[in-house]
Amino acid sequence: GQFRVIGPGHPIRALVGDEAELPCRISPGKNATGMEVGWYRSPFSRVVHLYRNGKDQDAEQAPEYRGRTELLKESIGEGKVALRIQNVRFSDEGGYTCFFRDHSYQEEAAVELKVEDPFYWINPG
């Protein structure tokens, strides 16, 4: 069946060095365990995280994200997931695309990550 993919609708904010969680879900909600779920970044559609065939597809992940991401899938049975990015870097800031693919049917949504410096307010003088 067909579905829509829905992102958070607002930018996700995280501090450098912290974790960021980017939620994504399908509507109407349904079991997405057997679907392909992923996040990529433009340009060049670099794979941030990919879950297919019931497991994380580590070999397809862009090197700069290797070991820093986790798919939170406690609610995948209801079509809800989130991407956790650990040890957030300034270079992680920007647009992400979340997608769900069921056989040949795919839909996606945009998610924005804003990365902030925890020390920006310190006056060096």
Epitope: G34, E36, R52, N53, K55, D56, Q57, D58, A59, E60
Partner: antibody, heavy 121, light 106 residues
């Protein structure tokens, strides 16, 4: 070098269960999943399921749901596949194969030698 | 259900000739296709993954091509040890194997 050594041939009666073992060596067992594939006599290959050797999580082909159980013993680097309610059409060679998802792609880069399971009354 | 159809079922060639084996998917599998070789009494061996990438230790005479629904395994200048059964496998949506192509000596 990577090696997967399976248990020996089995003869079972219809309705019985069989448990095939697959002992891995030459790599870190819990870093790679294990898949199971079977091949009936003079037939092609059929995927049965997969086990995450680190967490013990499993995914089974729909055809085998409810009849197959895949487990592992990380302390001995051994994966197990148990098939219950055996029928004559389950007669096949059963292979374990290392899942190369972490390093190459979602494919099978090393295989066990196979275990022949014969189901006959 | 996603199915893979291999052709021909049997291919009879002589050493030094070129073998062309085909695998067609019932729907797109993108580039998520692998090829395996199986000799009698042995387990399958991974040859190609990602439709065109040779696995470690596989000779350059084996090459894969294609994407979407149509794929080809080409074996140039056949060696005696290449005569075997070849299976394609998709891993785009779980896992399916083709029925195999038997490459035999003419």
């Amino acid at each position: 070098q990577v090696q997967l050594v399976q248990s020996g041939a089995e003869v079972k009666k219809p309705g019985a269960s069989v448990k095939v073992s697959c002992k891995a060596s030459g790599y870190t067992f819990t870093s790679y999943g294990m898949q199971w594939v079977r091949q009936a006599p003079e037939q092609g290959l059929e995927w049965m399921g997969w086990i995450n050797t680190n967490t013990g999580g499993t995914s089974y082909a729909q055809k085998f749901q409810g009849r197959v159980t895949m487990t592992r013993d990380a302390s001995t680097s051994t994966a197990y596949m148990e098939l219950s309610s055996l029928r004559p059409e389950d007669t096949a060679v059963y292979y374990c194969a290392r899942d190369a998802t972490r390093i190459l792609a979602d494919v099978l880069d090393y295989w066990g030698q196979g275990t022949l399971v014969t189901v006959s009354s | 259900e996603l199915t893979l159809t291999q052709s021909p079922v049997t291919l009879s060639l002589s050493p030094k000739e070129t073998a062309t084996l085909s695998c067609r998917a019932s729907q797109s599998v993108r580039s998520y296709l692998a090829w395996y070789q199986q000799k009698p009494g042995q387990a399958p061996r991974l040859l190609i993954y990602g439709a065109s990438t040779r696995a470690t230790g596989i000779p350059a005479r084996f090459s894969g091509s294609g994407s979407g629904t149509d794929f080809t395994l080409t074996i140039s200048s056949l060696e005696p040890e290449d005569f075997a059964v070849y299976y394609c496998q998709q891993y785009s949506s779980w896992y399916t194997f083709g029925q195999g192509t038997k490459l035999e000596i003419k």
